[in-house]
Amino acid sequence: DYKDDDESRTETQPPVTNLSVSVENLCTVIWTWNPPEGASSNCSLWYFSHFGDKQDKKIAPETRRSIEVPLNERICLQVGSQCSTNESEKPSILVEKCISPPEGDPESAVTELQCIWHNLSYMKCSWLPGRNTSPDTNYTLYYWHRSLEKIHQCENIFREGQYFGCSFDLTKVKDSSFEQHSVQIMVKDNAGKIKPSFNIVPLTSRVKPDPPHIKNLSFHNDDLYVQWENPQNFISRCLFYEVEVNNSQTETHNVFYVQEAKCENPEFERNVENTSCFMVPGVLPDTLNTVRIRVKTNKLCYEDDKLWSNWSQEMSIGKKRNST
């Protein structure tokens, strides 16, 4: 397909040839093309490309372009050739190549397909059945990410209420660039009756830490010392804690944000690997105090900033006063 700009053209290069498109993995779409035939000999060829909605304009010397995109809708790339990197230079007639999602009734595709990376150790995806699907549909989830050689099938399909889901191991690799990538997801049915659904989950989003584990509560004067075990797998700059203290007598509900803190006071079990400590000031020792803690990722490490861990198990200290 050829796309010509409406504006009158100065001398331009011929269009690129043999523009083709293919899909690698689950959601990596790759366009390749050949240089134009009969290009000027004094021209150092560059290729101008953008997607159908004029997004992501790029001028580069390579004869290929790829994008990671969930193939839930048609996507088109337009490519032209030119003799410089100047964006104001008019490229050749633009050639367009589109790729459509797999066929099927859109109403049959699963909806609300989303995934959460639990404690940087496993990913749990869930979805709702499409409107036009039979209740006995058997779903299959496929996934792929950079550290896998091939596409994998998720084995642990489950059902929770209206939602279906599947979880698979995904452990953070020491390679520092691991989290700069994404997991590609596809859900379809075994019988091939429903339209496949795709999702791309950036590894810098949707991270939910495990809850902390409270190890010890103790009083020193009017201060309450709290010691807990941090969730594994995270570095200290990427987490913070919310400590909630409820007092039965005053019915106060105090919330403290806490940076991972070393256990340096003599009241704490010291130098225990992967534990944090915090001192809650001004707590009445002769009343019942109940503590629970949850943890959240830091926005500078993980972009999705709305996922707290579940609350830890509560732990109490002090005496509940008899009501007279």
């Epitope: 200290s236 700059r237 913070f240 944000y257 940076q259 991972e260 830091n298 926005k299 500078l300 900033d305």
Partner: antibody, heavy 118, light 104 residues
Framework: EVQLVQSGAEVKKPGESLKISCKGS????????IGWVRQMPGKGLEWMGV????????RYSPSFQGQVTISADKSISTAYLQWSSLKASDTAMYYC???????????WGQGTLVTVSS | EIVLTQSPGTLSLSPGERATLSCRAS???????LAWYQQKPGQAPRLLIY???SRATGIPDRFSGSGSGTDFTLTISRLEPEDFAVYYC?????FGQGTKVEIK
């Protein structure tokens, strides 16, 4: 007591380089981020970037990426902000501040006034 | 990139009055990351509120923060003479443009 003490005011010419400092004390310097904030004369606050001295991980605001370099020397609990080639538009007050993981700036330095003029 | 818009630009009030300052985010943000600062002329800013509603150490209880999603509010229940200053909201890389609270 948590304290951040910044280096003194600087007067420079366009094209010159500069490195200003921020020394932390009274807390575990490697356990908190240090952020840098610019305030041009009569204007509001602008977040430039942060460093985590524990592992020297840095993040820059897109507007300041490539314009400045943030570094830290944890052995002397000091963070730095530097320019390789100053411009007149870099004239401003620069603040360092301690930042816990939830992103608020809870303790501030007194500020370093940088004046760039030919 | 998230934009924080503060309103009004200037608030003219008398000591003893209640001040209500607004900070609106261009998209929904986690309240954990929303902070408020006070800055007086010739001084460094001072943290008042973090996590949208938690008062920083040493901040009087006439200062309170509230809100979630895209709309956040800083309230000063009874203005004292020392409260006349510029107030900024912030979420990580982004500051609002500031609200000046001046004496009427």
């Amino acid at each position: 007591e948590v304290q951040l003490v910044q280096s003194g005011a600087e007067v420079k010419k366009p094209g010159e380089s500069l490195k200003i400092s921020c020394k932390g004390s009274g807390y575990s310097f490697t356990s908190y981020w240090i952020g840098w904030v610019r305030q041009m004369p009569g204007k509001g606050l602008e977040w430039m970037g942060v460093i985590y001295p524990g592992d020297s991980y840095t993040r820059y605001s897109p507007s300041f990426q490539g314009q400045v370099t943030i570094s830290a020397d944890k052995s002397i609990s000091t963070a730095y902000l530097q320019w390789s080639s100053l411009k007149a538009s870099d004239t401003a007050m620069y603040y360092c501040a301690r930042m816990p993981n939830w992103g608020s700036l809870d303790h501030w330095g007194q500020g370093t006034l940088v004046t760039v003029s030919s | 990139e998230i934009v924080l818009t503060q309103s009004p630009g200037t608030l003219s009030l008398s000591p003893g009055e209640r001040a209500t300052l607004s900070c609106r985010a261009s998209q929904s943000i986690s309240s954990s990351y929303l902070a408020w600062y006070q800055q007086k002329p010739g001084q460094a800013p001072r943290l008042l509120i973090y996590g949208a509603s938690s008062r920083a150490t040493g901040i009087p209880d006439r200062f309170s923060g509230s809100g979630s999603g895209t709309d956040f509010t800083l309230t000063i229940s009874r203005l004292e003479p020392e409260d006349f200053a510029v107030y900024y909201c912030q979420q990580y890389e982004t500051f609002g443009q500031g609200t000046k609270v001046e004496i009427k």
